[in-house]
């Protein structure tokens, strides 16, 4: 067909952005292109074309009219991770093609098992006490907090320091005695460790 004067090659006007999404949740990678004739949009992940509902109506990925890629739910197993990776959208018409910036889709995870549960501690009043835990593996890296007797620990108390997985009480009081739980949290949710007992003995 003849080149029409008003026709022009595709250009990407909205590039996809990096995403971190929880497994099972919906997600959208945006892509918008201009061109005349209106360009077709295809998505590629790691160099392989991404199958969508246009290829298989049962697909959990949908190519939206705008050109965006919509995931009905992010699929992510212990081994198979078909949705995680680096994506680009490619807009094409007879005058050429335009490729978007790379966008990484990462899947947030939070495993169940603590790498280290805190242990029971017994100290005398006035002595320091240290409890340590290593939260489950997670992405993003889980933050750590502590609960005492089921309630969040008051880390505004200047005697209490939480650094990494360590809970340090510089000078214990009788009232510090109780059941402590380490809590690992990220966007997926939170996990609680096994209970550790702090016993504070009278001198």
């Amino acid at each position: 067909s003849r080149l029409r004067q008003e026709d022009f090659p595709p250009r990407i006007v909205e590039h996809p952005s990096d995403l971190i999404v929880s497994k099972g949740e919906p997600a959208t990678l945006n892509c918008k292109a201009e061109g005349r004739p209106t360009p077709t949009i295809e998505w590629y992940k790691g160099g392989e074309r991404v199958e969508t509902d246009k290829d298989d109506p049962r697909s959990h990925r949908m190519l939206l009219p705008s050109g965006s890629l919509f995931f009905l739910r992010i699929v992510h197993g212990r081994r198979s991770k078909p949705d995680e990776g680096v994506y680009v959208c490619v807009a094409r018409n007879y005058l050429g093609e335009a490729v978007s910036h790379n966008a990484s889709l990462e899947v947030a995870i939070l495993r169940d098992d603590f790498r280290q549960n805190p242990s029971d501690v017994m100290v005398a009043v006035g002595e320091p006490a240290v409890m340590e835990c290593q939260p489950p593996r997670g992405h993003p890296e889980p933050t750590i907090s502590w609960k005492k007797d089921g309630s969040p620990l008051d880390d505004k108390d200047e005697r209490i320091t939480i650094r990494g997985g360590k809970l340090m009480i510089t000078y214990t009081r009788k009232s510090d005695a109780g059941k402590y739980v380490c809590v690992g949290t990220n966007m997926v949710g939170e996990r609680e460790s096994e209970v550790a007992e702090l016993t504070v003995l009278e001198r």
């Epitope: 392989e48 199958e51 992510h76 197993g77 198979s80 078909p82």
Partner: antibody, heavy 118, light 105 residues
């Protein structure tokens, strides 16, 4: 349509090797682990191992280590299973199966009958 | 290795019966348990994944339950097309149960 199509039936002599292929289509080949499972006549299912089509990494149960090789060619979206030093008790239907993101075998090949006989 | 023990190995039932098949793991596998149906000369077909989730396109008369070491597949009202062999599979490290053949009484 998502499917796995396997190579045809084979008849082999004891001591020989067999290579079974599994052509994947309709999905992103490198996104899903591929497993191999076999079934001797009248018997149950036996897992033989997996390959990560993205990296080529493999994992096998102790029973098959040293005798089974799993490879893939991403350019033609095909996985291969090579079993060496064949014995009569290797006579079975060999299946490839895709492991879904839900940790289950959601798509299976049609099976390849391998007969080992002198 | 995690050993999966399925019971019974075979059972006879009539159309309309409620059928229960059990699967026991030799150690805890959380909910990493799947169920498959296999008919003679055919590849297995996924019915239930993650112990209790129904695979797309599978009739709702099939259900799964359990976690840890003990799991159950239930067919609420057996249909003629359900006569087949059923396998459990743990996907924690991957192995299959021995199978349960469901035959016509």
């Amino acid at each position: 349509e998502v499917q796995l199509v396997q190579s045809g039936a084979e008849v082999k002599k004891p001591g020989a090797s067999v290579k079974v292929s599994c052509k994947a289509s309709g999905y992103t080949f490198t996104g899903y682990y591929m497993h191999w499972v076999r079934q001797a006549p009248g018997q149950g299912l036996e897992w033989m191992g997996w390959i990560n089509p993205n990296s080529g990494a493999t994992n096998f149960p102790q029973k098959f280590q040293g005798r089974v090789t799993m490879t893939r060619d991403t350019s033609i979206t095909t996985a291969y299973m090579d079993l060496s030093r064949l014995r009569s008790d290797d006579t079975a239907v060999y299946y490839c199966a895709r492991e879904s993101g839900d940790d289950a075998f959601d798509i299976w090949g049609q099976g390849t009958m391998v007969t080992v006989s002198s | 290795d995690i050993v999966m023990t399925q019971s019974p190995s075979s059972l006879s039932a009539s159309v309309g019966d409620r059928v229960t098949i059990t699967c026991r793991a030799s150690q805890s596998i959380s909910s990493y348990l799947n169920w498959y149906q296999q008919k003679p000369g055919k590849a297995p077909k996924l019915l239930i994944y993650a112990a209790s989730s129904l695979q797309s396109g599978v009739p709702s008369r099939f259900s799964g339950s359990g976690s840890g070491t003990d799991f159950t597949l239930t067919i609420s009202s057996l249909q003629p097309e359900d006569f087949a062999t059923y396998y459990c599979q743990q996907s924690y490290s991957t192995s299959f149960g021995g199978g349960t053949k469901v035959e016509i009484k």
